[in-house]
């Protein structure tokens, strides 16, 4: 075998809704023939599977061989190095991979304007991964909340921020005009998954959005 | 929303050492990581490093690899830059940016909530 391969120093999964992305980062001085290794585990099933003999790139999307991770205890994943015959020792994900540590996003955030109010429609990730009855609203079927962060351009950064349990909220301007500016984060209120914030969204309020009423 | 904040640039002789910043302002930071992007004129942005948030771990561009270390101390919500052995291909515009998906961490479209930049020069 020669001298011994070093091992990737670090390996994790990153992950939102079906996009399961497994990182480690690069050994030390590594030659332009280094390749990496990766290999599978599935909880309830104790063997290794070969998921990539030679990936060239520092990450490898698992989205396709992990779809039914919202229905399983979970998955490690194992990564070494590979230089022609010579191999490093395995670096295992060194936490379970399971729905815990997906982190939550927003498809997007739709606003409009009536009669004074910006009313908001979060639409949900609807990846194209995902089989067709694994909906993000089957699979976090309850508890779902938002945390609407509203930021008034120009402004000084200052923010009101509002925590809502449906996927349409309204916010009310107090009589103000300008471009407001929405940020969405999602939680499951009975899970521990972190949250994302969306990215954010502007819609301009003029006087002519308000009716006069007597 | 989330603001990103780079200082510590300025004007430096080649094989002289700079150290930069990047604070995160606005709320606690919680993306996955922060990576530094650096822009020479006429040039297109590219990936000058970056780092994971939780498990520290690092990334180079093979130009910077063995000369610069990127760092992060999560309680101040900051990323540092060290640069040393500076060359005059070092000189750019140095742009801070979070990770906000799961994708590379060598991919532009992994990041977002961009930074103002800060100069970097450094003259032979």
């Known amino acids: 075998h020669g001298t011994e391969l070093p091992s990737p120093p670090s390996v994790w999964f990153e992950a939102e809704f079906f996009h399961h992305i497994l990182h480690w980062t690069p050994i030390p001085n590594q030659s332009e023939s280094t390749c990496y290794e990766v290999a599978l585990l599935r909880y309830g099933i104790e063997s290794w599977n070969s998921i990539s003999n030679c990936s060239q790139t520092l990450s490898y999307d698992l989205t396709a061989v992990t779809l039914d991770l919202y229905h399983s205890n979970g998955y490690r994943a194992r990564v070494r190095a590979v230089d022609g015959s010579r191999h490093s020792n395995w670096t295992v994900t060194n936490t379970r991979f399971s729905v815990d540590e997906v982190t939550l996003t927003v498809g997007s955030v739709n606003l409009e304007i009536h009669n004074g109010f910006i009313l908001g429609k979060i639409q949900l990730p609807r990846p194209k991964m995902a089989p067709a009855n694994d909906t993000y609203e089957s699979i976090f079927s309850h508890f779902r909340e938002y945390e609407i962060a509203i930021r008034k351009v120009p402004g000084n950064f200052t923010f009101t921020h509002k925590k809502v349990k449906h996927e349409n909220f309204s916010l009310l301007t107090s009589g103000e005009v300008g471009e407001f500016c929405v940020q969405v984060k999602p939680s499951v209120a009975s899970r521990s998954n972190k949250g994302m914030w969306s990215k954010e969204e502007c819609i301009s309020l003029t006087r002519q959005y308000f009716t006069v009423t007597n | 929303q989330l603001q990103l904040v780079e200082s510590g640039g300025g004007l430096v002789q080649a094989g002289g050492s700079l150290k930069l910043s990047c604070t995160a302002s606005g709320r606690t930071f919680d993306g996955y990581g922060m990576g530094w992007f650096r822009q020479a004129p006429g040039k297109e942005r590219e990936f000058v490093s970056a780092i994971n948030w939780i498990y520290g771990a690092t990334y180079y561009a093979d130009s910077v690899k063995g000369r610069f270390a990127v760092s992060r101390d999560k309680a101040k919500g900051t990323m540092y830059l060290q640069m040393n052995s500076l060359k005059p291909e070092d000189t750019a515009v140095y742009y801070c940016?979070?990770?906000?998906?799961?994708?590379?961490?060598?991919?532009?479209?992994?990041?977002?909530?961009w930074g103002q930049g800060t100069q970097v020069t450094v003259s032979s």
């Open positions: 940016a979070a990770k906000i998906n799961a994708g590379s961490y060598f991919n532009i479209g992994s990041f977002g909530s």
